[in-house]
Every structure is written in structure tokens, then in C-alpha cells.
């Protein structure tokens, strides 16, 4: 019995659902009562899911797996794995037995995009040409381990005096910290690029240092210039720092985080004490770091509604404030493609191809093209609907007149994550049915 699985690993983002495709060709007269289907971990042989005696025997894998019961009779033995975790990465074997027996293994490659790096300087004030400065580039919650590259403002690679460390958290996601030590010139731009080698996703930030004396007087409050990009459901750090003077104590500090537009209180620290979250109990300071001038705010389980500007007010004797923007994002799923009509197709027929991608944010950009890369812009209708969480489902419809044969591909881009998800369908020139019958 021939069992077919994809040659390439299935790449799945942490927290999303993945389909491990597996198919066989049922003979005429085949009934599900004859089918024994077992999914197991290739290495440990641990049972994941099974179908036997005409019945789905259910998930043996943390209750996160499912078959496609309506499609089994057509030979579709694929497995749906929900809420993918780093620990799921590896090889899964699909065993199919009817009268004969066959098996094949499919690899699951787990990935998570890295956050936009934050850059910190040490020391961060009174910098003069000739000073040695340590620039730290930190990017969070990615998988697998990142590749990190530094360069100056002219694109010259900086490879000396770089130390990069990567630490996995309990979920197996990596936080990467890369430290560059440089001697300051008259001025300089230093940029750090963090690459996810599986997603081929680049996250980069840069810092421009113009050595000079800081003006005395008001408290200088520093926040990132660029918006902080956070994935829905993850935690985000809104960075804010000030430079405490010698002899500074927390009893002198008044720190207030509030929504810039509405002035709604988010979190505060006064009278030497953390006054707690006033924002749905999802915020926290970094109490151990406050004395060093780190007034950053941690926002947990980010939602679409959190997007916007947050102001960090710091008062000691003097007063200063700065606003940081939070940009929320969620990756779009791999598009599914449907045809209407979907059978007995002939050249000259008009067909409607629908490309659907789910649960992304912000609104997607959708591009269609043919098999030669020629953009298809006529007869395209795209609609995007937000669900209760504010995440968008995108449906793009292309109407085409079939030629002898043709490939039509749809690319759904998340403009913030610069994440592309694409699907394609190839329609051959003889009478055919879609999806092709096994």
C-alpha cells in the first residue's frame, strides 16, 4: 500500500495549528471498517492518534490532535495538530493498513518569529569620541536559534568584539542578546539584524550615537523610536529608561505609565512602592531594575485592543516623559484555495478561485499572479472581516477564464511582520475535478 506524505518538513508557527498531510489510494469498494490508521512519533513510537474498527480512537497526544473524518474514505489520513509547541518538533509516522500495509514519515519543523530588536547603550550618557561603549541588541521569543549580524551605517560588517547568547525559556522559545563593544568615533550608526533561519524572517534595529554632553535640567526619559511590535497572545516589553543620579533612591521616584491619548492610568510606582496594574491586571514593572533607571513596562497576553501609544512619566526632582508605540500583529495562516465550479473543468470555462487566510493582524495585502509571475489584478475582489478579538480573516476572489492550463497563486502579506503566506492551484487543460481525485 503506497502512503504519501510531503517530502519537505511542515513548518508551523508556535501557537498555530498544523496539518501533517498523509494520503493513500483506496480501492473500489473500500469501507472505513477495513481501515487501521495509526499516527505515532517516529523515534519513540509514542502513539499520537488512531482510527480502528471503523471508529476514530481519538487523540493520545495531549488532546491536541484530530483526523479529518469526512475525508478518510477518500484516502486522506492527514493529522491536525493544534496549538503547536516547540516540543512537538520532530518526525511523525503515518501507518495505514487495509489489507496491505504502508507507512511514511513526515517532519514537523516548529518556528516562531523574533521580535523587533531593542537596543541599549552602556554607558548611555556623557558619551565622547574615543569612549568604549557596549551596545546590546535583544530580541525575544523566537525559534529556532537566531543568526545575528552587526553592521555600521555604511553596511560594513562588524564581527569583532561581538558576543551573542541565546537562552530558551520554559516553552523552548529563545531570547537572544548580542553585545557589540565599540570605540566611538565622531558619530556612528550601529545596526543589528536578527534572522530566523527557518522562516527567513529578518528583524532589525539600529542606533545612531552622536557623542555629546546631555543637557542638565529635566529628567531625560528614553524610549525606542520605532514601535514595539508584539504578536497577539505574547508578552511585550515597552522600554523606558532614565539616568538616576548618584545617591538616587526609589523613595524619590514617581513613575506613571498611561495611555497617551485617553490619559487612562496603566501602571504606577509612587512612594517607594509598586502601586500595581490599573490595566486589566496584565501589566508589570521590573522592580529589581528600577533603581538602575529601568522603568520598562511588561504587558502580558497582548490583544489587538492594546495597540497604540503609551506614555512613560518619570519624576524625581525634575520631570520627564516620552511616548512609546505598541504595534500589535498576528501572522496570517497559509491560504486555502477553493475553485467554483470544481469539477469537469475545460478550457474557456470561467472559474472563481477563492483564497482564504485567517486570524491575522493588521489587515493583509493580497497579491495574485499566474505561473509566470505575471500579476493578476483584474477581476479580483478582496474582503477582510475582523472577529471579536479584532483578528482579520481575508477572502480574496479571482475570476478567470481557463486557458489550456494554468497556475494561479495568491500571496497574503502581513505588512507589519513582512510575513508572506501563499497558496497556489494548478488547473490542467483536460476535463478535471478539483481537488484532483485520488
Amino acid at each position: 500500500l503506497e502512503v504519501q506524505v510531503p517530502e519537505d518538513p511542515v513548518v508551523a508557527l508556535v501557537g498555530t495549528d498544523a496539518t501533517l498531510c498523509c494520503s493513500f489510494s483506496p480501492e473500489p469498494g473500500f469501507s472505513l471498517a477495513q481501515l487501521n490508521l495509526i499516527w505515532q512519533l517516529t523515534d519513540t513510537k509514542q502513539l499520537v492518534h488512531s482510527f480502528a474498527e471503523g471508529q476514530d480512537q481519538g487523540s493520545a497526544y495531549a488532546n491536541r490532535t484530530a483526523l479529518f473524518p469526512d475525508l478518510l474514505a477518500q484516502g486522506n489520513a492527514s493529522l491536525r495538530l493544534q496549538r503547536v509547541r516547540v516540543a512537538d518538533e520532530g518526525s511523525f509516522t503515518c501507518f495505514v493498513s487495509i489489507r496491505d500495509f504502508g507507512s511514511a514519515a513526515v517532519s514537523l519543523q516548529v518556528a516562531a518569529p523574533y521580535s523587533k530588536p531593542s537596543m541599549t547603550l552602556e554607558p548611555n550618557k556623557d558619551l565622547r569620541p574615543g569612549d568604549t561603549v557596549t551596545i546590546t541588541c535583544s530580541s525575544y521569543q523566537g525559534y529556532p536559534e537566531a543568526e545575528v549580524f552587526w553592521q555600521d551605517g555604511q553596511g560594513v560588517p562588524l564581527t569583532g568584539n561581538v558576543t551573542t547568547s541565546q537562552m530558551a525559556n520554559e516553552q523552548g522559545l529563545f531570547d537572544v542578546h548580542s553585545i557589540l563593544r565599540v570605540v566611538l568615533g565622531a558619530n556612528g550608526t550601529y545596526s543589528c539584524l536578527v534572522r530566523n533561519p527557518v522562516l527567513q524572517q529578518d528583524a532589525h534595529s539600529s542606533v545612531t550615537i552622536t557623542p555629546q554632553r546631555s543637557p542638565t535640567g529635566a529628567v531625560e526619559v528614553q524610549v525606542p523610536e520605532d514601535p514595539v511590535v508584539a504578536l497577539v497572545g505574547t508578552d511585550a516589553t515597552l522600554r523606558c529608561s532614565f539616568s538616576p543620579e548618584p545617591g538616587f533612591s526609589l523613595a524619590q521616584l514617581n513613575l506613571i505609565w498611561q495611555l497617551t491619548d485617553t490619559k487612562q492610568l496603566v501602571h504606577s510606582f509612587t512612594e517607594g512602592r509598586d502601586q500595581g496594574s490599573a490595566y486589566a491586571n496584565r501589566t508589570a514593572l521590573f522592580p529589581d531594575l528600577l533603581a538602575q533607571g529601568n522603568a520598562s513596562l511588561r504587558l502580558q497576553r497582548v490583544r489587538v485592543a492594546d495597540e497604540g501609544s503609551f506614555t512613560c512619566f518619570v519624576s524625581i526632582r525634575d520631570f520627564g516623559s516620552a511616548a512609546v508605540s505598541l504595534q500589535v500583529a498576528a501572522p496570517y495562516s497559509k491560504p486555502s484555495m477553493t475553485l467554483e465550479p470544481n469539477k469537469d473543468l475545460r478550457p474557456g470555462d470561467t472559474v472563481t478561485i477563492t483564497c482564504s487566510s485567517y486570524r491575522g493582524y493588521p489587515e493583509a495585502e493580497v497579491f495574485w499572479q499566474d505561473g509566470q509571475g505575471v500579476p493578476l489584478t483584474g477581476n479580483v475582489t478582496t474582503s477582510q472581516m475582523a472577529n471579536e478579538q479584532g483578528l482579520f480573516d481575508v477572502h480574496s476572489v479571482l475570476r478567470v477564464v481557463l486557458g489550456a492550463n494554468g497556475t494561479y497563486s495568491c500571496l497574503v502579506r502581513n505588512p507589519v511582520l513582512q510575513q508572506d503566506a501563499h497558496g497556489s492551484v494548478t488547473i490542467t487543460g483536460q476535463p478535471m475535478t478539483f481537488p484532483p481525485e485520488a
Partner: antibody, heavy 121, light 106 residues
């Protein structure tokens, strides 16, 4: 129009030196690094080194470090490459090129027309 | 030194054919650039920052990446594509080019 115009062809004796110029126009000369690349007859491209006309910082391919000097004259927006102790295997077309882009992606967007240097006794 | 190895060195292709050129880096690179050079001409920027087409480059050109392999694809070769193509990196010193792939039209 952004342009790099190089000096004319040179024929040199082994052991001598050659100095090739590259005049930039149409952009701020100090904003981008200028690189030098050579191509021997029928061969591929080989990087020699670069100069930052603003800071005058240079860096060289180890292979050319001892024999090459890169300089830049900001007043005339001209970069120079001098190669000494010439040997027959230095016979090549020498190109200057501007390394352009924006952080963190850069590439050679403008090339000079090339200067043929022939080393022959 | 990061060595870039292009394959094949030479390819003779019929118009309308699909062509692939692979540039394999000996270690990870921050990004890859590609240049096109025709006989007796200076190289021209062709693809920058791994997959962005330079100005005027036809959309039949594309690049895909798998690990340290960067693959340049010409979807349907045209006569004007006959040239030598070079990949280039500068993630660490020295800046290096691939040895080049020459495309000839049959």
C-alpha cells in the same frame, strides 16, 4: 545622474605601480563607501577593498593588503586605488563601485566603466 | 572567509526554459546580492537583499533560500538573459563573490 567615471587604460612593467582614479558625481560623495573590484581576463570578480570617503577608514582583502593603498579626495569627489609591485597576474579590469542601500541591506548599485591594467615586460 | 560556490559554472539553455542557479555559502550570511554581467560591460545590480529585484529587472527573476543555499530562478528564459551571474555577500570580511555562472542561449 549618479556616475562613477574611471581613468583610462594603463600598460605597466612588472615591479612598477599603477594608480587608478574614480570620479563620483550626482550624489554626496561622503555618504557611501567606494569599493574596488577586479576581474582578470575570463575570470570572476575579486574584491580588493573599500574606503569610506567621510572617515577615510579603509579595509582590504588580505590578499591585497600589502600592495594596495586606497585614498579619497573629498574636494574633487575622487577615489584612488594604487597597486604596487605589479606582476603579470595583476593584468585585469579594475572597477570602482558604490556600496549603497539602507540599513541593514546594501549592494553595489553603481559601477565605474572599468580600467584595464596590463602588466607586461 | 565565507566562500560562495555557484552551480553550475555554465549552462546552455533554450529560450522559454526555466533556469536555476544556486549559490551556496560556506556559512550563514546576513543577505545575498546578485549581479548580471554581459561581455565587455560592467556588472549591473540584479537582485539585492536576498530577494529584491533591482530597478528594471524583469519579474521572471526570483530568489528562494533554503539554509545557506540561495537559488536564483529565471521562470522563462529570454535571449536578453544571456550573461554571467554573480552572487555576493558581505556578512564578514572579506567581501566575497561566487565564481559566476555563465548562461548561454542555445
Amino acid at each position: 545622474e549618479v556616475q562613477l567615471v574611471q581613468s583610462g587604460a594603463e600598460v605597466k612593467k612588472p615591479g612598477s605601480s599603477v594608480k587608478v582614479s574614480c570620479k563620483a558625481s550626482g550624489y554626496s560623495f561622503t555618504s557611501y563607501t567606494i569599493h574596488w573590484v577586479r576581474q582578470a581576463p575570463g575570470q570572476g570578480l575579486e574584491w580588493i577593498g573599500y574606503i569610506n570617503p567621510n572617515s577615510r577608514n579603509t579595509d582590504y582583502n588580505q590578499k591585497f593588503k600589502d600592495r594596495t593603498t586606497l585614498t579619497a579626495d573629498r574636494s574633487t569627489s575622487t577615489a584612488y586605488m594604487e597597486l604596487s609591485s605589479l606582476r603579470s597576474e595583476d593584468t585585469a579590469v579594475y572597477y570602482c563601485a558604490r556600496y549603497s542601500g539602507s540599513t541593514p541591506y546594501w549592494y553595489f548599485d553603481v559601477w565605474g566603466q572599468g580600467t584595464t591594467v596590463t602588466v607586461s615586460s | 572567509e565565507i566562500v560562495l560556490t555557484q552551480s553550475p559554472d555554465f549552462q546552455s539553455v533554450t529560450p522559454k526554459e526555466k533556469v536555476t542557479i544556486t549559490c551556496r555559502a560556506s556559512s550563514s550570511v546576513s543577505y545575498m546580492n546578485w549581479y548580471q554581467q554581459k561581455p565587455d560591460q560592467s556588472p549591473k545590480p540584479w537582485i539585492y537583499a536576498t530577494s529584491n529585484l533591482a530597478s528594471g529587472v524583469p519579474s521572471r527573476f526570483s530568489v528562494s533560500v533554503s539554509g545557506t543555499d540561495h537559488t536564483l530562478t529565471i521562470n522563462s528564459l529570454e535571449a536578453e538573459d544571456a550573461a554571467t551571474y554573480y552572487c555576493q555577500q558581505w556578512s564578514s570580511n572579506p567581501l566575497t563573490f561566487g565564481q559566476g555562472t555563465k548562461l548561454e542561449i542555445k
